[in-house]
């Protein structure tokens, strides 16, 4: 991959600090369903234990069937820092629901990320920013806390913080969808 | 209003060299990633190279590898594409385009340049 | 990489017509597709992203559908100003890739 180093606050394509981003619909503009692994090819799988469910990041048999996950894309208000409207294009939000009534949310106090039974609308904590990077993997940033992204740490997910000076390749934070 | 003014186009000889460039404002130029399309006389739209502003990836259409270097200078709100080893299979309109989204490539490109003109012939 | 076949690759028709123009992927997924409409001598325009949204500014006779490999572009009662090629591209996976192009000329 190329480098190209250009290192103002958010040159980086994270969303500006302090910005608040505001849900342009209610409903989401198109879902999928897809299977996650990390950057690594590990599976990220989901157990009902004990009435809640965990979250595992794990190689996977060769027959055993990877857990979809629903992604739900919304559409976001990008503020603006330079252009006189206030507003400067879109971003895509998504939600990501691997059971019926379950969403994956952010923990900003533990650090971690947790599944979450809710009915909508679903709090801030359930949308993350999506990043297109490294040409076919994808990153998920925190709604609720600028530059902290989902990502891979102990074979569990937590929330990782991403200094905006760094590049965002990190593979801890690159995960890959499958359709198929 | 967005606009986006390419320059740099014209007529050189197999071999040569050339640099593209495109102007970009009206929006936040380095939240969003950036790309060259082309589009050879008669033909359809060709994706050459983009640019995205996280970590500064790159791509680039096999045709082109080793030839053309895409990059930016976010102060001066610009993309480039400078173009080597030209072939006459390189003669195309030169289009430079925003992505819709600014983390995301998946709603392809709102707005495009008017295009400049590359020939390669002797 | 997504290989995207458009047909027909050119269509007569009279203004208040009803034009559709579909786009077939080599391998499907699930509705990152755009539809762009371009004149000649100018730039592509954005019509239609994720498949079935409208760009801002774009007129409501023109409609998307579709996913997995099986995509269409839909332009009711025609106008003259709808005259032009209309390419789509798959926005999914890199590379992003184009159809072949699609003329609507005047019968």
């Known amino acids: 991959m190329g480098s190209s180093h250009h290192h103002h606050h958010h040159s980086s394509g994270l969303v500006p600090r302090g910005s608040h981003m505001s849900i342009t619909g209610i409903s989401p503009i198109t879902e999928s369903l897809a299977s996650l692994s990390t950057y690594n090819d590990q599976s990220i799988t989901f157990a009902l234990e004990d009435e809640s469910y965990e979250i595992y990041v794990e190689d996977l048999k060769k027959d055993k069937k990877k857990d979809k996950v629903l992604l739900s894309y919304y559409e976001s208000q990008h503020p603006s820092s330079e252009s006189g409207d206030g507003v400067d294009g879109k971003m895509l939000m998504v939600t990501l629901s691997p059971t019926k009534d379950f969403w994956l949310q952010a923990n900003n106090k533990e650090h971690s990320v947790e599944l979450h039974k809710c009915e909508k609308p679903l709090p801030d904590q359930a949308f993350f920013v999506l990043h297109n990077r490294s040409f076919n993997c994808v990153s998920f940033e925190c709604k609720t806390d600028p530059g902290v992204f989902i990502g891979v740490k102990d074979n569990h997910l937590a929330l990782i913080k991403v200094d905006y000076s760094e590049n965002l390749g990190s593979e801890n934070i690159l995960f890959k969808l499958s359709e198929t | 209003e967005v606009q986006l003014v390419e320059s740099g186009g014209g007529l050189v000889q197999p071999g040569g060299s050339l640099r593209l460039s495109c102007a970009a404002s009206?929006?936040?130029?380095?939240?969003?990633?950036m790309s060259w399309v082309r589009q050879a006389p008669g033909k359809g739209l060709e994706l050459v190279s983009d640019l995205r502003t996280s970590g500064g990836s790159t791509y680039y259409a096999d045709s082109v590898k080793g030839r053309l270097t895409i990059s930016r200078d976010n102060s001066k709100n610009t993309l480039y594409l400078q173009m080597n080893s030209l072939r006459a299979e390189d003669t195309a309109v030169y289009y430079c385009?925003?992505?819709?989204?600014?983390?995301?490539?998946?709603?392809?490109?709102?707005?495009w340049g008017q295009g400049t003109l590359v020939t390669v012939s002797s | 990489d997504i290989q995207m076949t458009q047909s027909p690759s050119s269509v007569s028709a009279s203004v208040g017509d009803r034009v559709t123009i579909t786009c077939r992927a080599s391998q499907g997924f699930s509705s990152w597709l755009a539809w762009y409409q371009q004149k000649p001598g100018k730039a592509p325009k954005l019509l239609i992203y994720a498949a079935s949204s409208l760009q801002s500014g774009v007129p409501s006779r023109f409609s998307g559908s579709g996913s997995g490999t099986d995509f269409t572009l839909t332009i009711t009662n025609l106008q003259p100003e709808d005259f032009a090629t209309y390419y789509c591209q798959q926005a999914n996976s890199f590379p992003l890739t184009f159809g072949g192009g699609t003329k609507v000329e005047i019968k």
């Open positions: 385009a925003k992505s819709h989204y600014s983390t995301s490539w998946f709603g392809g490109f709102d707005y």
């Open positions: 009206g929006f936040t130029f380095r939240s969003f990633a």
